[in-house]
């Protein structure tokens, strides 16, 4: 049976230094002894879930297996459950700790909610920063540019350090960072524009920090279903975040009578949240949840950890799937709105725009939808995966690339109705956004699968990275500029307008068809990966002599 | 040597119409952006409206006074900025300068770093 | 819309004195305020953007000041040629707006 006092403790925050200290004394002597960092005295991360006897491990995925045993010759643990017992030990009720850990999640994906709110705030009054500093098009296109740009910099950097320091510290003190920035960057005069691009940076380096950093500790604290659940929570944050951003961008702004007022309001959220997290989140260890030794913290190099994620066929093409899903979300986004506005030119429905912003209501209703569909994308791909690992060990990879072969369908259908119906374009925007964003929480979870937590941090960071370099940083210049190419072999008129930027469109589909094979290709991939890196982790529950990775 | 040299102007019935225009020359007119400002006799200055460049979809602003009367329009590759007035009242009598906003690529200002001579229009019947 | 109140409307004084001219905003506005000089029968011209940076070509002895609601415009030792109207101009917000003008005229 698995030791219940350790999966409680496991669960449990950080205690007094002099408790920890004297069970780590405690666990070097079991160690010695074992041959297997027992569960005895396990601090907030928990032992490796060993039980008095010495039998038994929980893995990734929550299971129970037989424990390694330590090296010839070796007694077992017949002092492992009077230690457990022992003064030094404490055993707080499950019930407590599960409330605990659901606090940690709730803040964790607040902060991720403030996240996005801060990003899509900027999105939200940035017609109004472009007449304030006389921005150009292709000034608001260098904003852009330089947060995705420090955001996928910075990325890695955290993933390095997420995976070797004390991360509540480096999430908190990066939500304090962007909150600072973003705050400042409200009392920015005209004449310096390249500051707000700096302040731009800067916030992407900050937020860089959050999005590479959370999802590993919500890793850490929970297994199976329940995880797929938190990390649903989490990602669906995405959504609602944006929507709040832009809700709040334009309300705080009519409201103030001032845009500058709207970039006051998630900082401090920012600072009250970042406090909250120093307090409420526990400082985890890393494989926290799959019951692993206080010992557990990253030792390889860097280097080593890129070759491992390069050589994990899973999370090579779960990450190339994912790239395909920021493509098509990145050039959707910019370009759907302009698209049905000149559907409806067309459909003589609408006036030519000559004075922008066009689209202005096609943007709030897409942007609604965007909103809508990523809650319940979210929403129907956990529970199609809870549904579906009852029927197959490869049910992850296998819902997000129906997911995606599904939604490339009725992307492509956008084009098709739009010509004739609106309200048609938007049914088949909205089925294929559900669709296209019922993979984010799965991809993060097939990530906790297939990669040990020590190198979580810095996956989370390639990831981020690989799908914003292929992604959503080139796909709506691409998308402009082979438009623009069409319209030039082509004679000027408002139907051209709209079929060169229909016809560049249709690249989406094409791109969100390849994401989907990726998936399909994760699924031959992903039980063997998920068995090697389980074997790994009952690796790093042994003494640091026999460990490799 | 940048140059701004406005023509047009005239005498004109009360709800008639009249275009004025502005020849430039001296700097890159197609990223700059320009405005017409207008001074009534013994007067201050007063905006009257602006028109961006191409990077910012030629998009034009104007004062309330104006709005719904006036129309700003660019040829760029004329190197012209236009002022198009309809139903012209009384006290649209003025002097009109064509100006240019400095600019810096990514962005421009909206201070007038250059004027025109100035066009007189009277508008009396 | 943001309305500029240039003081006093006109300002008397004579060659070699110091003077300021003030423009006040009915809300704040940071530093974006420009100066214009406007001799007689002429088209204005540039002096300083942003409340205190002078263009290229001014004379040193045209400085700006100020930030928020209120802007000065500082003229060291007046010459001859700076009797003219100066005009403030905002460019916080559209619609863009000038102040009434200040006239310099010789004591």
């Known amino acids: 049976m698995m030791c219940l006092e350790c999966a409680s403790a496991a669960a449990g925050g950080a205690e007094e230094e002099e408790a920890d200290a004297e069970r780590r004394r405690r666990r070097r002597g079991a160690q010695r002894g074992a041959g297997g960092s027992g569960c005895c005295g396990a601090r907030g991360a928990g032992g490796a879930g060993v039980s008095a006897a010495g039998d038994e491990v929980q893995t990734l995925s929550g299971s129970v297996r037989r424990a390694p045993t330590g090296p010839p010759g070796t007694p077992g643990t017949p002092g492992c459950a009077a230690t457990a017992k022992g003064p030094g030990a404490q055993q707080p009720k499950p019930a407590s700790l599960g409330r605990g850990r659901g606090a940690a999640a709730a803040i964790l994906s607040l902060g991720n909610v403030l996240n996005y709110l801060d990003r899509y705030t900027v999105a939200g009054v940035l017609l109004d920063i472009q007449q304030h500093f006389g921005v150009k098009d292709r000034g608001a296109g260098l904003l852009q540019s330089v947060f995705i740009c420090s955001f996928m910099v910075a990325a890695p950097i955290f993933g390095y350090l997420g995976d070797r320091f004390n991360r509540k510290v480096i999430l908190s003190c990066g939500i304090f960072f962007w909150s600072a920035v973003t705050f400042s960057s409200s009392f920015i005069p005209q004449q310096y524009f390249w500051l707000l691009v700096l302040s731009r940076g800067l916030v992407g380096i900050g937020e860089a920090s959050y999005s590479t950093i959370a999802p590993t500790i919500i890793g850490d604290l929970f297994t199976k279903n329940t995880r797929t659940l938190m990390l649903s929570v989490f990602y669906f944050a995405i959504p609602l975040g944006s929507g709040l951003g832009y809700i709040t961008g334009s309300s705080v702004k009519q409201a103030a009578g001032d845009w500058h007022w709207a970039l006051r309001v998630s900082p401090v959220l920012g600072m009250i949240t970042g406090t909250l997290i120093l307090i409420l989140v526990p400082a985890t260890k890393r494989g926290h949840a799959d019951q692993l030794g206080d010992q557990l913290k990253a030792r390889t190099s860097w280097l080593r950890d890129m070759k491992a994620l390069i050589r994990n066929r899973s999370y090579v093409f779960s990450s190339l799937a994912t790239s395909a899903v920021s493509f098509a979300t990145g050039a959707l986004g910019m370009w759907i709105p302009l698209y049905l506005h000149r559907a409806q030119v067309v459909q003589k429905t609408a006036e030519t725009c000559n004075s922008p912003p066009c689209g202005a209501k096609d943007s709030l209703i897409f942007g609604a939808i965007t909103c809508f569909t990523g809650f319940l994308g979210v929403v129907t791909g956990a529970g199609a995966t809870r549904w579906c690992r009852l029927k197959t060990q490869r049910a992850d990879p296998l819902v997000c690339a129906v997911g995606m072969l599904g939604s490339a369908i009725f992307i492509c259908l956008i084009f098709v109705a739009a010509k004739s119906s609106i309200v048609g374009a938007y049914i088949c925007i909205f089925v294929g956004e559900t669709l296209l964003f019922s993979n984010w929480a799965i991809t993060a979870d097939i990530l906790m699968y297939v990669v040990i937590p020590t190198r979580r941090a810095t996956a989370v960071a390639l990831q981020s990275f690989t799908s914003h370099l292929l992604g959503d940083a080139g796909s709506p210049y691409l998308i402009g500029f082979i438009s623009d190419l069409i319209r030039q072999s082509t004679k000027d008129s408002p139907l051209w307008e709209f079929l060169s930027l229909g016809y560049a469109l249709m690249l989406c589909p094409f791109v969100v068809v390849l994401g989907g094979m990726f998936f399909l290709a994760t699924a031959l991939f992903f039980v063997s990966d998920r068995a090697r890196a389980e074997q790994q982790v009952n690796q790093l529950a042994m003494p640091p002599a026999s460990v490799k990775v | 040597e940048v140059q701004l040299v406005e023509t047009g102007g005239g005498l004109v019935q009360p709800g008639s119409s009249l275009k004025l225009s502005c020849s430039t020359s001296?700097?890159?007119?197609?990223?700059?952006?320009m405005s017409w400002v207008r001074q009534a006799p013994g007067k201050g200055l007063e905006w009257v409206g602006l028109?961006?460049?191409?990077?910012?979809?030629?998009?034009?602003n104007y004062a309330e006074s104006v709005k719904g009367r006036f129309t700003i329009s660019r040829d760029d590759s004329k190197r012209r900025v236009y002022l198009q007035m309809y139903t012209l009242r009384d006290q649209d009598t003025a002097t009109y300068y064509c100006t240019s906003h400095e600019d810096f690529y990514y962005y421009s200002s909206y201070y007038f770093d250059y004027w025109g001579q100035g066009v007189m229009v009277t508008v009396s019947s | 819309d943001i309305v500029l109140t240039q003081s006093p409307a006109t300002l008397s004084v004579t060659p070699g004195e110091s003077v300021s001219l003030s423009c006040r905003a009915s809300?704040?506005?940071?530093?974006?305020i420009h100066w214009y000089q406007q001799k007689s029968n002429e088209s204005p011209r540039l002096l300083i953007k942003?409340?205190?940076q002078s263009m290229s070509g001014i004379p040193s002895r045209f400085s700006g000041s100020g930030s928020g609601t209120d802007f000065t415009l500082r003229i060291n030792r007046v010459e001859s040629e700076d009797f003219s109207v100066y005009y403030c101009?905002?460019?916080?917000?559209?619609?863009?707006?000038f102040g009434s003008g200040t006239k310099l005229e010789i004591k």
């Open positions: 942003y409340a205190s």
């Open positions: 001296g700097f890159t007119f197609s990223e700059t952006w």
């Open positions: 809300q704040g506005i940071s530093t974006s």
């Open positions: 101009q905002q460019s916080y917000n559209l619609p863009l707006t």
């Open positions: 028109i961006k460049d191409k990077n910012s979809n030629y998009e034009a």
